[in-house]
């Protein structure tokens, strides 16, 4: 199977690495622009320079290219709790992340929200909080895990899955109730 190539990839593959085929004259290979710059004018002929210009503030190109425009810098989503790790430069997009003791939950491939790492109160840390994963907690006896928090077995209703984990406690409660009747 031959991988499908787009028109631009097909044209670029004719030229050596670091060059691209002139859009109006396929016998000319022009040098690509360095990262941090964009294509202002194609090279006029073989061995002649491509006219590349530096990206303006608020835009960037992160790799060698023959783009007619620089890419707009990303903005960190404050409403998602994101903070700026490093600001945009002409050759690198903004890097967004979360604060200390927070992790990322990805709603989609590129959109994440910051959440506080669980502290495992009434339990112990089984796996530490990671950049993209919350702490994994193990609960102490008399507690069960609900939404990654250790909750007292006194909050366990018989219909819930916690009954297995809290079975001794439930039996004890039942036993003390029964012992009170004569």
């Amino acid at each position: 199977l031959v991988p499908h190539l787009g028109d631009r990839e097909k044209r670029d593959s004719v030229c050596p690495q670091g060059k691209y085929i002139h859009p109006q004259n396929n016998s000319i290979c022009c040098t690509k622009c360095h990262k941090g710059t964009y294509l202002y004018n194609d090279c006029p002929g073989p061995g002649q320079d491509t006219d590349c210009r530096e990206c303006e503030s608020g835009s960037f190109t992160a790799s060698e290219n023959h783009l007619r425009h620089c890419l707009s810098c990303s903005k960190c989503r404050k409403e998602m709790g994101q903070v700026e790790i490093s600001s945009c430069t002409v050759d690198r997009d903004t890097v967004c992340g979360c604060r200390k003791n927070q992790y990322r939950h990805y709603w989609s491939e590129n959109l994440f929200q910051c959440f506080n790492c669980s502290l495992c109160l009434n339990g112990t840390v089984h796996l530490s909080c990671q950049e993209k994963q919350n702490t994994v907690c193990t609960c102490h006896a008399g507690f069960f895990l609900r939404e990654n928090e250790c909750v007292s077995c006194s909050n366990c209703k018989k219909s819930l899955e916690c009954t297995k984990l809290c079975l001794p406690q439930i039996e004890n409660v039942k036993g003390t109730e029964d012992s009170g009747t004569t």
Partner: nanobody, 122 residues
Framework: EVQLLESGGGLVQPGGSLRLSCAAS????????MGWVRQAPGKGLEWVSW????????YYADSVKGRFTISRDNSKNTLYLQMNSLRAEDTAVYYC???????????????WGQGTLVTVSS
């Protein structure tokens, strides 16, 4: 066929509470993020809140943070919105939405219900 049926709307005084429900059918509820969108009279659609499949991860618009709580019961295929400390500006038609994420931006809702009207007035 995907169906989303909202209920629980009505007239409530400022400071009051309401609980909206949304019964979902026609698709695997446990595979999708669900959300609430609202439309105030004469205004555009506004995201209120959404909730991940796990029921833990939630998003709230700044305008409702601390007052509204979204939840879901995957065993009942039902989405909820508990609305407390209601204000006049919360008056709107509230729509339940099944979310279909794009790779780069906020979610798009590919299905939504007929809506339930919430009126906050004294």
């Amino acid at each position: 066929e995907v169906q989303l049926l909202e209920s629980g709307g009505g007239l409530v005084q400022p400071g009051g509470s309401l609980r909206l429900s949304c019964a979902a059918s026609g698709y695997t509820f446990t595979e999708y993020t669900m959300g609430w969108v609202r439309q105030a009279p004469g205004k555009g659609l506004e995201w209120v809140s959404w909730i991940a499949v796990d029921g833990i991860h939630t998003y709230y618009a700044d305008s409702v943070k601390g007052r509204f709580t979204i939840s879901r019961d995957n065993s009942k295929n039902t989405l909820y919105l508990q609305m407390n400390s209601l204000r006049a500006e919360d008056t709107a038609v509230y729509y339940c939405a099944k979310l279909d994420w794009t790779a780069t931006d906020f979610s798009i809702f590919d299905y939504w219900g007929q809506g339930t009207l919430v009126t906050v007035s004294s």
